[in-house]
Each structure stands twice: as structure tokens, then as C-alpha cells.
Interface confidence: low
């Protein structure tokens, strides 16, 4: 349906509060360096304009596209050239090129300092004084750090944030109430950001087909009672939603997401028995609840897969007549029967099945050729199962920090050219898979671990794409989305790497290390470990364990000393000399 004024249509659909929030998020994701107040003004002006168009649709400029209106607004920012350099050149272009240009300038690693929340009393005073501004600040700070954050979900998290403050600012001990709740929310937000970045990368680098395949597998696992047509309908709508958000079309994205939630709730009988609770909630909570809803029970009467996909004499005919539909049906049927498999594994199985049919349907006797296709899946299933088992055992033995260090060594040896901060960040996140997944029951471990690893490795790919330094990383990132994790797992030590020159400055530590929170202390130690490996890539695990143990003792000793700085400057060089000697 065509509307006279697109902006009025979105304003009416979303309501003023959500409209303003989404505009603020959109601008913050595009112009990540601008101060909060600039974005507040821009969002206010756009919202006022939308309100005027809603009152009078034929008003001046109300018929313009959202890209034109938003782009024109962005191009009024006075400091565009100073703050963003060549991004200002986007303003010379016409739509849709201008929007594409803005998208290309989104920075996945803007390098802002971590958000340090002020004291609880200050936060509560600010929250109670001006709630709207306070929540706007939250949207802005998250959006500029995560330029691909799923915008409607960010509005939901802002609502959760508001709930936390409404509750905790009344509490006797505000800090005790806020601390754990804000930390739990922070973890959720970071995971949400990484998951959406993975979805956007799937769409942008591998296209709609890859994203749809991923979604078919995931939704078939979650809604095994729904038929393939129903899953396909939801997947098509979901793809549109994520394409819009990944493309910066946040108003359309949020509006379409609300429509999808409405559709699912109106058709819950043919989707899942688990949706009822979600469907009684208001729109933001409803969509979030549907996205996180627990898996429905499997129907009891599922026939063997072999009947339709191996034994049926028409397999090649069905495949050749409509390849994507046939493979989609195979993926759907396989996924709904295997909730314990990771989505990545299911997609690898579907790919293997496709390759087998391509080969066999060209032979004289296809049925004989593909007769054992399902048995040939075994090694593909065994590989992630063994990987998860081995790594969970290692995690249980070493704990999270030790497991992170093991991964740090592993990945630095695989790709020593990658920057130290990236190796530390990614290995720390990979290490969290242990905490997140290893305590789960066997039936949930693989899907938890491998799908989480895919999301984290996507972060490595996104950061590496910005400044490519390793051909092997580029290869693993770009060849196949579903095989990224096995590709990285299969990388051996890079024998072509020329060790980095020793730089004493890298291993110089100061007393400020002692006052850092534990996590930041760990990052400092892990940074030293990576630098050590880049200097001595042939170091054995035993040598590294010794050196890291000495390093830990050195930090502990100096932090307990009367003259901390004196201790660091005196003992530091001795430690470095001992480490160099130990690693000869």
C-alpha cells in the first residue's frame, strides 16, 4: 500500500515515543562521533516534522522518502567534514547512493572508552529528574558503540533499563540493587549486538539465501509443529525485517517487526503452543518474548526422513523442479527432528545433501548413488560433538580465565598478524562459551556452543575486514558462512610468520595496574601473553605457563608493596629478562 507521506505513516504506526527513540538510534548509528545534544536536537526536529506531516499529509516535503529526509538532515550537521572526513562526500551523492555511502562509513570499532556508570545516587537523581533524557542517553551510548544494533530490541532494553532504575532508585541500598541488574542487562545487550551483527553480515556478505536458510533451520527447531509453508512465511517476513534494520531503515524495520509479531499471535495455533504468554504483552515485550520463546514439543508422529529424501523414486525430479524449495523442505524436516544440533551443523548437512544430489542426479543410477547419503552425515555430526566435548573438558579443568588463555595461545598461533587488541577481545569472548554452554545438558551443548562461536568469529571477521592482515583469516571469513568455525578450528600454526621485534615498552607495567577491576587486569595480562607469543611464536605451553605464572606473582608482589611504582620499575625489567631467557 502506497502512502502519501511515508514519514507520517511510520509516525502513526509507531507512536511518538518509539518513533523518536528510533530516530535517535538511527542518527547515533550513522554519526557515531557527534555529541548527545546534537542527536537530541536532530531527533526532536525530525519528530516535530513527522508530527506535522501526520496532521497534514500534503504538507511541504512530507511526500519525500525517509532516506531523503534522513540524509538531508544528516547533511545539515556542521561538523561533518571535521569529525568524519570523507563521510561528508556522501552528501554530494543522490539517493539511494547517499544512504549506501553512509552505511559504508559505519564503524564497528569506534574506540570509545568503555561506559563507566557514575555513582548510583547520581544516576538515580538524573533518572528521576528527566527520565526521557536519561533513557535517550542510554540509547545514544549503546547505538554509537554498536552501529548495527537491532533497533527495536534496543528500545526494549531501554525499557528494561528504565524498569531497573524505577525499582532500584527506591531501594535502601541503591548500589546493591543496581549493580547485578545493570551487569545482567549489559551482558544481554552485548550478546544481542553480536548476534545482530552476525545476521547483518550474513545478509550483506552471503545474501538473502544464506540468511533464509539460517532462519529456516532455527525456526524449524523452535516451532516443530508448524508446517513448512508457515515457517517459510515467517522466515520471509523476518528476512525483510532484518534487511531493513541492517540497511539503516529502522522505522520500517520496527514497524514490520510489530506486524510480524501480530501475525504470529493471530496464527499461533499453526505455529507453536508456546506463544500464548508472549501474545498478551505490549508490542516491545511481545516481539522480544517471541524471539526468545522456548522450543515447542516435537509432534509424536514424525516419519523417517529417508522416506521423502532417499527412498522416494522422485527425489531427483523433485530436486530439479524446485531446488530451493526441496532443499528448504529437507532443512526444515531435519531441523525439527534435531533440536540438539547447531544451526551451523544443520546447514552443513543440507549443503552436503545438496552436493550429493548434484552429483548423483547426473548419474545413470541416482538412487544407488545417494542411497547412503544420510549415513555420510556422521563425520559432519561427530566433528562439532567431539570439539565441544574436548573444549568443555579443558574449560572444566582450567576455569574461564585459563580457558581464555589457552584459546589466546591457539588463535595467536593461527593468526599472529591480527592486532593484539582484536586477538584478546575475540579470545576472551570465545572463552565465555565455556561458562555459557558447558554447564548445559548434553542435548543443548552443541547448539549453544557452535552457534555462539559463529557469532564471536563473525566479530573477528568484521574487525579483520576493516584492516585485513592475514590471508588465512580472510579465507575462513569469506569462503563459506557455515564453514567458518570448522575453517578456523582447522587452522594450524602459521609457519610463515616472522616473529615481532622485542619491544621493552610493551612489557613495562605501572602501579595503576593494581587499582584496575579484575577483568581489566586480566586483559593487561592477556595482552602481554599475546605480545610474548608474537615475539616467541615457538614457545611451548609449558614455557608460557611458567612465564605467565611468574608474571602473576610479579603483579601480586608489586601491588602489595609499600612503594608500588618503585617495585614495578625495579622488578619489571628482571621479569622481562627472565622471560626472555626462559623462552630461548
Amino acid at each position: 500500500e502506497a502512502y502519501k507521506s511515508e514519514i507520517a505513516h511510520r509516525y502513526n504506526d509507531l507512536g511518538e515515543e518509539h518513533f523518536r527513540g528510533l530516530v535517535l538510534v538511527a542518527f547515533s548509528q550513522y554519526l557515531q562521533q557527534c555529541p548527545f545534544e546534537d542527536h537530541v536536537k536532530l531527533a526532536k526536529e525530525v519528530t516535530e516534522f513527522a508530527k506535522a506531516c501526520a496532521a497534514e499529509e500534503s504538507g511541504a516535503n512530507c511526500d519525500k522518502s525517509l532516506h531523503t529526509l534522513f540524509g538531508d538532515k544528516l547533511c545539515t550537521v556542521a561538523s561533518l567534514r571535521d569529525k568524519y572526513g570523507d563521510m561528508a562526500d556522501c552528501c554530494e551523492k543522490q539517493e539511494p547512493d547517499r544512504n549506501e555511502c553512509f552505511l559504508a562509513h559505519k564503524d564497528d570499532n569506534p574506540g570509545f572508552p568503555p561506559l563507566v556508570a557514575p555513582e548510583p545516587d547520581a544516576l538515580c537523581a538524573a533518572f528521576q529528574d528527566n527520565e526521557q533524557l536519561f533513557l535517550g542517553k542510554y540509547l545514544y551510548e549503546i547505538a554509537r558503540r554498536h552501529p548495527y544494533f537491532y533497533a527495536p530490541e534496543l528500545l526494549y532494553y531501554a525499557q528494561q533499563y528504565k524498569g531497573v532504575f524505577a525499582e532500584c532508585c527506591q531501594a535502601a541500598d541503591k548500589a546493591a540493587c543496581l549493580g547485578p541488574k545493570i551487569e545482567a542487562l549489559r551482558e544481554k545487550v552485548l550478546l544481542s549486538s553480536a548476534k545482530e551483527r552476525f545476521k547483518c553480515a550474513s545478509l550483506q556478505k552471503f545474501g538473502d539465501r544464506a540468511f533464509k536458510a539460517w532462519s529456516v533451520a532455527r525456526l524449524s527447531q523452535r516451532f516443530p509443529k508448524a508446517d513448512f509453508a508457515e515457517i517459510s512465511k515467517v522466515v520471509t517476513d523476518l528476512t525483510k525485517v532484518h534487511k531493513e534494520c541492517c540497511h539503516g531503515d529502522l522505522l520500517e524495520c520496527a514497524d514490520d517487526r510489530a506486524d510480524l509479531a501480530k501475525y504470529m499471535c493471530e496464527n499461533q495455533d499453526s505455529i507453536s503452543t508456546k506463544l500464548k504468554e508472549c501474545c498478551d504483552k505490549p508490542v516491545l515485550e511481545k516481539s522480544q518474548c517471541l524471539a526468545e520463546v522456548e522450543r515447542d514439543e516435537l509432534p509424536g508422529d514424525l516419519p523417517s526422513l529417508a522416506a521423502d529424501f532417499v527412498e522416494d523414486k522422485e527425489v531427483c525430479k523433485n530436486y530439479q523442479e524446485a531446488k530451493d524449495v526441496f532443499l528448504g523442505t529437507f532443512l526444515y524436516e531435519y531441523a525439527r527432528r534435531h533440536p540438539e544440533y547447531s544451526v551451523s551443523l544443520l546447514l552443513r548437512l543440507a549443503k552436503e545433501y545438496e552436493a550429493t544430489l548434484e552429483k548423483c542426479c547426473a548419474t545413470d543410477d541416482p538412487p544407488t548413488c545417494y542411497a547412503k547419503v544420510l549415513d555420510e552425515f556422521k563425520p559432519l555430526v561427530d566433528e562439532p560433538q567431539n570439539l565441544v566435548k574436548t573444549n568443555c573438558e579443558l574449560f572444566e579443568k582450567l576455569g574461564e580465565y585459563g580457558f581464555q588463555n589457552a584459546l589466546l595461545v591457539r588463535y595467536t598461533k593461527k593468526a599472529p598478524q591480527v592486532s593484539t587488541p582484536t586477538l584478546v577481545e575475540v579470545s576472551r569472548k570465545l572463552g565465555k562459551v565455556g561458562t555459557k554452554c558447558c554447564k548445559k545438558p548434553e542435548s543443548e551443548r552443541m547448539s549453544c556452543a557452535e552457534d555462539f562461536l559463529s557469532v564471536v568469529l563473525n566479530r573477528l571477521c568484521v574487525l579483520h575486514e576493516k584492516t585485513p592482515v592475514s590471508e588465512r583469516v580472510t579465507k575462513c571469513c569469506s569462503e563459506s558462512l557455515v564453514n567458518r568455525r570448522p575453517c578456523f578450528s582447522g587452522l594450524e600454526v602459521d609457519e610463515t610468520y616472522v616473529p615481532k621485534e622485542f619491544n621493552a615498552e610493551t612489557f613495562t607495567f605501572h602501579a595503576d595496574l593494581c587499582t584496575l577491576p579484575e577483568a581489566e587486569k586480566q586483559v593487561k595480562k592477556q595482552t602481554a601473553l599475546v605480545e610474548l607469543l608474537k615475539h616467541k611464536p615457538k614457545a611451548t605451553d609449558e614455557q608460557l605457563k611458567t612465564v605467565m605464572g611468574d608474571f602473576g606473582a610479579f603483579v601480586e608482589k608489586c601491588c602489595a608493596a609499600e612503594n608500588k611504582e618503585g617495585c614495578f620499575s625495579e622488578e619489571g625489567p628482571k621479569l622481562v629478562a627472565a622471560a626472555q631467557a626462559a623462552l630461548v
Epitope: F36, E37, P118, E119, A122, A126, D129, N130, L133
Partner: nanobody
Framework: EVQLVESGGGVVQPGGSLRLSCAAS????????MGWFRRAPGKEREFVAA????????YYADSVKGRFTISRDNSKKTAYLQMNSLRPEDTALYYC?????????????????WGQGTLVTVSS
């Protein structure tokens, strides 16, 4: 644009009191969070106190809690800092600041406008 001018500084004995004023010109202050910061000789600038736009919420640094009181009179376009039980370590140049979009009161980067400062010396 808002211009801020502090007054009321001076020399006072330990245990004594002073009242600082911050007069704004050029714009109403009712849409600004008002804050006081100080810089002691050779030290970094530090947050002292802040008051919300309506005056309903106040916030203090731990070091001055219970001794200093911040208030404002929007009709007079003035903010105040009543300082009691002064100590030698309160000696500093005191600045008044106004923040249009301030959401986290104790962060100096949240304030858009600053006065030149008024000197407070606590000494026997």
C-alpha cells in the same frame, strides 16, 4: 548562550562557612542542570555538587556530603553552594557549570557552560 559568573569566595578559618553564588545571564537556567566543580592547586578538577533542573534532586561528592548544600532560584537565574564546616582540603578554585543535556551529573564533559571560578582558601 549562557554566561556564568561566580562570587562569594574568600579566605575563611577551618570550621567556618561560605556561600557561593553563580549568576547566569543570557538565558533562563530552568532547562539546565547546575553543578559545582573545584580544582585544588596541582590537582585535577573534581566534581562537588549538582542540582536538577527543577531543584528537586541534588547530588554530592562523598567528600562534601553533609557539609555542603546546593540550591537554586530559577526566577533569579542563580545557583548557590552553601559550604559549612570548611576544612583546609576544601581550598580550591570553585567553578559553576550548566548542562543542557546532562544525564550523568558528576561527569564534567556533560556540562556545556562554565564560569571563570571563585577562589576559596581555608586556612588558620
Amino acid at each position: 548562550e549562557v554566561q556564568l559568573v561566580e562570587s562569594g569566595g574568600g579566605v575563611v578559618q577551618p570550621g567556618g562557612s561560605l556561600r557561593l553564588s553563580c549568576a547566569a545571564s543570557g538565558s533562563t537556567i530552568s532547562s539546565y542542570v547546575m553543578g559545582w566543580f573545584r580544582r585544588a592547586p596541582g590537582k585535577e578538577r573534581e566534581f562537588v555538587a549538582a542540582i536538577s533542573r527543577s531543584g528537586g534532586y541534588t547530588y554530592y561528592a562523598d567528600s562534601v556530603k553533609g557539609r555542603f548544600t546546593i540550591s537554586r532560584d530559577n526566577s533569579k537565574k542563580t545557583a548557590y553552594l552553601q559550604m559549612n564546616s570548611l576544612r583546609p582540603e576544601d581550598t580550591a578554585l570553585y567553578y559553576c557549570a550548566a548542562g543542557r543535556y546532562s544525564a550523568w551529573y558528576s561527569q564534567s564533559y556533560e556540562y556545556d557552560y562554565w564560569g571563570q571560578g571563585t577562589l576559596v582558601t581555608v586556612s588558620s
